[in-house]
Amino acid sequence: MAQGAVIHVAPEQPTHAVCVVGTATPLDVRGSAPKGYTTFGITASPGVIVDVIHGPPVKKSTMGASKWPLDPELEVTLQVKAASSRTDDEKVRVSYYGPKTSPVQALIYITGVELSLSADVTRTGRVKPAQAGKDQSTWTWGPGGRGAILLVNCDKEDPQASGMDFEDDKILDNKDLQDMSPMTLSTKTPKDFFEKYQLVLEVPKAKMNRVRVFRATRGKLPSRYKVALGPQQFSYCLELPGGQHSTDFYVEGLAFPDADFKGLIPLTISLLDKSNPELPEALVFQDSVTFRVAPWIMTPNTQPPQEVYVCRVSDNEDFLKSLATLTKKAKCKLTVCPEEENIDDQWMQDEMEIGYIQAPHKTLPVVFDSPRDRGLKDFPVKRVMGPNFGYVTRKLYMSELTGLDAFGNLEVSPPVTVRGKEYPLGRILIGNSGYSSSESRDMHQALQDFLSAQQVQAPVRLFSDWLFVGHVDEFLSFVPARDKQGFRLLLSSPRACYQLFQELQSQGHGEATLFEGLKRKRQTINEILSNKKLRDQNAYVESCIDWNRAVLKRELGLAEGDIIDIPQLFKLAGNSRGNSKAQAFFPNMVNMLVLGKYLGIPKPFGPIIDGHCCLEEEVRSHLEPLGLHCTFINDFYTYHVYNGEVHCGTNVRRKPFTFKWWHMVP
């Protein structure tokens, strides 16, 4: 809230004070009242509004002037109607009265000034002049919320630059400016005002490394923008002329919300009285605008796709062809990382997660680069980040990382309502260990902290450490549905697979084989159903998926009807530590690419019955009634045998939500 310094009244000698238009300035009439005086009267020139907060006046004089008792509860405030054209051009007279004494007069000369710091606190995408009396220092969530929003300026307008735009203290061009939030300081004062007064813009020292403020000066680009505040500077003295003046600032975020930073940055303008060189500057007035750094937001499968990313590796030409056809049907762009840039690392999903940041005036896609640094490590920096495409990462030591820090282990649900609480941007899903042991793997705490700190997609922790690779995308996916719920959760289900195979066996198809057309040992339905070891392993897997099913139902507010079981078998294999972990027995169909109504599903090579793969037909029977088109893509030798599938090998940039994150209440 804007605050003016208390004006102390000095009887028998004039007081000089500054009042800011729109701010009620306290006037202390009681503290300096001469001894023996019990009441007072007050008059002011027409440009000053006097407000006395008290009971009714003790006495009204015949002249119409009122008298008030000098009680402890007394509060007197002054407001100026407009800025003064000359210093001291408004007057307030206080008259003190006592039962046995003659009246004593105190005279206050007031200079009215206009002084306001404006930002887009109403979230319209435009800076409107600050409304008098409206608090700009608190930031509130919700549709009626107020408070300015700041973007981390994390894109790279100059493709030749070495880093992100916020990593230097220059403004490149107007495009760079658009990534920043404008703020205006408006002043209207007498001509000689700033000979005795000083304006200072400041940011709390603890937050100076999270923000940079540029001041626009008259001149040519780009030198007309000077750094006012930032990591090296927490306060900035403004040299301003008197009269009416407007100073434009541009504010850029330097850091995303995180464990040690809630995302709020107050910028404060202080008016200091420096009229007496013998004394320290006195604080006359202060106003603040609080900005919140826009969170990084993930997009679920239900959002329309805009661009698909995939790697070219040796022998995946046929896979690329299928993917090209799928992306063309879905009308989204296809970006292929060439072999020389991925160094045999085809796991595009694990390398990055593409989300976005949004302010009322600008929306920017932002790639979150996983700390998993393999062959694709330069792809997000070199090929994704660029003009109007931001970048964020959390660097961790390789020794601290596990396979669960790759972003196949980072998903997000569609919007949900859980026991009356709305999550209009969905909830982040990450995989961890079910219980801690010396062998257990979890997503690194620094990543979990970052995701939680964004506040708008409260994370749900799932159990994924039972898997060999350990990613949530190995047992779940979401697909859009043309109904009220708008989506279905797909879960891998050994139970559904055994049921299907038993049914087919009872219909006389027991000799139908899996893996037909592949250079590997074919297995019949009969062999699979009679394999006790495989059954036991899948009973264990089912229990792990059931655990997650319960968590998902509870944390996403889902009913059984919102879940589709996708037939899938797993097998256990020893990992490097000798622990048994689950791998897909045949290509893992839930690990699919969702491009609107077009699905790219790993071809399962299931038993062929009447010329059709029974696993494909089963999946079609669940998904096609939802208006979805299933394309089964052969990823067997290029992805499946390396413990990944279509989803692991691809990535998608999706359309941001139409819902504005600031309208929610976390």
Partner: antibody, heavy 118, light 111 residues
Amino acid sequence: EVQLQQPGAELVKPGASVKLSCKASDHTFTTYWIHWVKQRPGRGLEWIGRIGPNSGGSKYNEKFRTKATLTVDKPSSTAYMQLSSLKSEDSAVYFCAFSNYLDYLDYWGQGTTLTVSS
Amino acid sequence: DIVLTQSPASLAVSLGQRATISCKASQSVDHDGEGYMNWYQQKPGQPPKLLIYAASNLESGIPARFSGSGSGTDFTLNIHPVEEEDAATYYCQQINEDPYTFGGGTKLEIK
């Protein structure tokens, strides 16, 4: 959408080489696959080969492997096809075609008419 | 190489009627349940223009009177109702196997 500029005609002597160009208007040049197609009067269309984004993934029709060499120059957003040891049967219209999706030829140049004659 | 045989070599169709062009491949051009057959239209002095991709998918901006069907080795392009501006040569092209090959073309004349 991308526009492809090809020179209208080239006249070359037998035995010589020629480098045909195809300039793209689009700055996202490096996201396209560039295909070359030959058309002789009354002989239909023949696919020569393609070169992938960032010069990756070249693929040739075996019939043209010794005849054509595909390259790209990223700074100028230009694709080239060099044809060597030219004979009269190399006289044809040569089209460049760009694809966003590997092998679906979305955008075509107007073609360069190559005449091999002494 | 996969040989594509188009028929008829030419046909004349009355305005508003249906034009049907067939393309037979010497071997299947299917992959992952998709027929990798495309159809192009070429008018004199112009480059070819993609009409239909992956057997049956209409390219963006192409009128809905063009449709494609088929799988394996047999594919069809239909134009209905035929309009004046459809007079052109139509080519099928397979992209399932190297080298990608084109059919010999079908010249459509409007009566």
